[in-house]
Interface confidence: low
């Protein structure tokens, strides 16, 4: 049975946020093998997945997970009650909202039940491991003839999030991005009425309520403006220009087509 687990790409740098301990042993045996690192992410403070690479074990092993909160009222050791599986082997644990205490030090312990001395403990700051859901309900409205305002919602305490807005027109090679603080709105002061704009937003649990490094997924994009660019030759010309730029980077001396030239070609 393959279970898909929602975890972001990339490793959280938790060197300052946890330590690993392995119980000592007298002889070289399986108990000296290091246990895989546990990675935890709190999804929108609704649930938390703590996962490990089960395939790193020399033989298939159903590792067990225990957890508690250090120096708090919740310091009683708890067993994982909802394991996640990969190829029918435990590869994670899911904790529900009531078991998540963001501002207490979370201690997670992985253990090999066949070798009880083989265990590893990590301490995590959960407020730095929150990943919000993607922003929703993106809306655009005109503030003036040339100014647009983008608004959005988050299914979380907006106060705790910062945001990154990206936008581009159909003529652009890349996104332009702008950081936005906890107030979920963004203004674009100068809009070209002849172009079609695409906007998207992502959010992060930072800096007010935590210092998370991971962003949410991007929102569904929202569009504004003329659709005509989709059918005109300008995009083809831009692609050609991009090829020329690439070739120039490789040492060619081709003349680049300027945007002004492209407009000229397009209108004639």
């Amino acid at each position: 049975l393959n279970t898909t687990i929602l975890t972001p790409n990339g490793n959280e740098d938790t060197t300052a946020d946890f330590f690993l301990t392995t119980m000592p042993t007298d002889s070289l045996s399986v108990s000296t093998l290091p246990l895989p690192e546990v990675q935890c992410f709190v999804f929108n403070v609704e649930y938390m997945n703590c996962t490990w690479n089960s395939s790193s074990e020399p033989q298939p092993t159903n590792l067990t997970l225990h957890y508690w909160y250090k120096n708090s009222d919740n310091d009683k050791v708890q067993k994982c009650s909802h394991y996640l599986f990969s190829e029918e082997i435990t590869s994670g644990c899911q904790l529900q909202k009531k078991e998540i205490h963001l501002y207490q030090t979370f201690v997670v312990q992985l253990q090999d039940p066949r070798e009880p001395r083989r265990q590893a403990t990590q301490m995590l700051k959960l407020q730095n491991l929150v990943i919000p859901w993607a922003p929703e309900n993106l809306t655009l409205h005109k503030l003036s003839e040339s100014q647009l305002e983008l608004n959005w919602n988050n299914r979380f305490l907006n106060h705790c999030l910062e945001h990154l807005v990206q936008y581009r027109t159909d003529w652009d090679h890349s996104w332009t991005e702008q950081s936005v603080d906890y107030r979920h709105k963004f203004s674009l002061p100068s809009v070209d009425g002849q172009k079609r704009y695409t906007f998207r937003v992502r959010s992060r649990f930072n800096p007010l309520c935590g210092s998370a490094q991971h962003w949410s997924e991007w929102s569904h994009p929202i569009h504004w403006g003329s659709n005509t660019s989709k059918e005109n030759p300008f995009l083809f010309a831009l692609e050609a220009e991009q090829k020329l730029i690439s070739e120039e980077d490789l040492g060619g001396e081709q003349k680049l087509i300027s945007e002004e030239d492209l407009h000229h070609h397009h209108h004639h």
Partner: antibody
């Protein structure tokens, strides 16, 4: 231990200048927006300035705009407030605080008097 | 600028009393409001952020509610260490502004 420590307060004559410093420790300074807030003797709190994480964006209250400027050195975990053209009404305890006030410095008293 | 008006400005109460302080905003500030406690000679201490979220380490007898233009801070059972001044602050619009404060005194 997470803390902010201000320094640089003192007595200054009207029209004079003063530079306040705020040293941060115990947290990743460049992850946080920072603010300056002041409190005149026996009065309430007044927000006066804000600076973004990278230090590229600043906002000021009208009462200090054009006279005060804030900057930060993330490499040194420090924040500063340069106060010029000081007036008697600038007399107050000045606090630096982490963005929305979860961590405050102990405050430093600035007295503007001839 | 957004004006915040706190009521009352002074409040006399006894240990064990339930105390409510109100903060009115001159325009809608959504939930972008925080509450602080300040004792003489000390820096303010954050109690509540986002109108109703209890700051870590703050006793659960403190609670906040409201959104839009009317907000309240409630102390369910006043303790001796709660005699202090309380301020609301809005973070919805620049410039950020504070209420004038409420001083809670021993009756």
């Amino acid at each position: 231990q997470v803390q902010l420590v201000e320094s640089g307060g003192g007595l200054v004559k009207p029209g004079g200048s003063l530079r306040l410093s705020c040293e941060a420790s115990g947290f990743t300074f460049n992850d946080f927006y920072m603010t300056w807030i002041r409190q005149a003797p026996g009065k309430g709190l007044e927000w006066i300035a804000y600076i973004s994480k990278s230090g590229d964006k600043m906002r000021y209250a009208d009462s200090v705009k054009g006279r005060f400027s804030t900057s930060r050195d993330n490499a040194k975990n420090s924040l500063s407030l340069q106060m010029n053209s000081l007036r008697a009404e600038d007399t107050a305890v000045y606090y630096c605080a982490r963005f929305y006030g979860d961590i405050w410095g102990q405050g430093t008293l600035v007295t503007v008097s001839s | 600028d957004i004006q915040l008006t706190q009521s009352p400005s002074f409040l006399s109460a006894s240990v064990g009393d339930r105390v409510t302080i109100t903060c009115w905003a001159s325009q809608d500030i959504s939930s972008f409001l925080v509450w602080y406690q300040q004792k003489p000679g000390k820096a303010p201490n954050l109690l509540i952020y986002a109108a109703s979220a209890l700051q870590s380490g703050v006793p659960s007898r403190f609670s906040g509610s409201g959104s839009g233009t009317e907000f309240t801070l409630t102390i369910s059972s006043l303790q001796p260490e709660d005699f202090a001044s309380y301020y609301c602050e809005q973070l919805n619009n620049y410039p950020w502004t504070f209420g004038q404060g409420t001083k809670v005194e021993i009756k």
